[in-house]
């Protein structure tokens, strides 16, 4: 169960969707992507404190064990729960073509 949407660390500190503007050069894509020339990358950034947006029981267990054994068990990670597709116009051996990538942009986030 996804629970705990209140961030105890303060506003903006916990796992959430953020948008980062990146050029093709930033991404290392300039040699094979023609458009878009700039990407508004939505990604999951932030801490995963106890029970915050826990994706499932495993994440809850991970949180508990991390408190007990921080050197052995890492804290849950902030990752996409789902994705938005995006089309890229790319160079190929046979010319320019379209390719849709289903897992390029994060749609929402959780801790796992």
């Amino acid at each position: 169960a996804r629970n705990g949407d209140h961030c105890p660390l303060g506003p903006g500190a916990c796992c959430a969707l953020h948008t980062v503007r990146a050029s093709l050069e930033d991404l290392g894509w300039a040699d094979w992507v023609l458009s878009p020339r700039e990407v508004q990358v939505t990604m999951c950034i932030g801490a995963c404190p106890s029970q915050f947006r826990a994706a499932n029981m495993h994440a809850q267990i991970k949180t508990s064990l991390h408190r007990l054994k921080p050197d052995t068990v890492p804290a849950p990670c902030c990752v996409p729960a789902s994705y938005n597709p995006m089309v890229l116009i790319q160079k190929t051996d046979t010319g320019v073509s379209l390719q849709t990538y289903d897992d390029l942009l994060a749609k929402d986030c959780h801790c796992i």
């Epitope: 023609l34 458009s35 878009p36 938005n84 597709p85 995006m86 089309v87 116009i89 379209l98």
Partner: antibody, heavy 117, light 106 residues
């Protein structure tokens, strides 16, 4: 495989509203960077861009026609609609819809001929 | 709006001849697309962003240019190249097309 097909009334009288539908398959308007554009071509003449509608529901219109154009979409049914109000004989043309990927009319429909008479 | 002027309006070429079609923009644009439209059919893209050949387009087609002047070259014209050719800019709205060049084969 991407396909698009335009449908319209065929013949219309001056001052009426022209309603066009673009039905498409092979792509989704939920995809970032994807849109559908409308272009028209009077018989024997060149191409004129009319409007684009994008995945995020942004709409852009040809400024010369903007007051007469209305764009909408039904993403779940893969359809885009264009209405042109107060038509006259100058609107007689073949109307194309096309898949737009960022800045590229990548795939076009076969076109539908609309005659204002 | 950016006006695109294509020249010549009509061009007649012999098989195997190299020809160049030009497109002049009223204001500077970053890139230009080129579309081909054969009689009774929908347009299809030939050149994407000034110089990139679209998938499946024969290598005899090429594009170049910058600023306000762009060109499309066919290195060795074939009978199937008889068509109308349009340049297209999207640097600013409204997107515009050139008036077209009709290529006839002698």
């Amino acid at each position: 495989q991407v396909t698009l097909k335009e449908s319209g009334p065929g013949i219309l009288q001056p001052s009426q509203t022209l309603s066009l539908t673009c039905s498409f398959s092979g792509f989704s308007l939920n995809t970032h960077g994807m849109g559908v554009g409308w272009i028209r071509q009077p018989s024997g003449k060149g191409l004129e861009w009319l409007a684009n509608i994008w995945w995020n529901d942004d709409k852009y219109y040809n400024s010369a026609l903007k007051s007469r154009l209305t764009l909408s979409k039904d993403t779940s049914n893969n359809q885009v609609f264009l209405k042109i109000s107060s038509v006259d004989t100058a609107d007689t043309a073949t109307y194309f819809c096309a898949q737009v990927a960022w800045d590229w009319f990548a795939y076009w429909g076969q076109g539908t001929l609309v005659t204002i008479s | 709006q950016i006006v695109l002027t294509q020249s010549p309006a009509i061009m007649s070429a012999s098989l195997g001849e190299e020809i160049t079609l030009t497109c002049s923009a009223s204001s500077s644009v970053r890139y230009m697309h080129w579309y081909q439209q054969k009689s009774g059919t929908s347009p299809k893209v030939l050149i994407y962003s000034t110089s990139n050949l679209a998938s499946g387009v024969p290598s005899r087609f090429s594009g170049s240019g910058s600023g306000t002047f762009y060109s499309l070259t066919i290195s060795s014209v074939e009978a199937e190249d008889a068509a109308d050719y349009y340049c297209h800019q999207w640097s600013s709205y409204p997107w515009t097309f050139g008036g077209g060049t009709k290529l006839e084969i002698k």
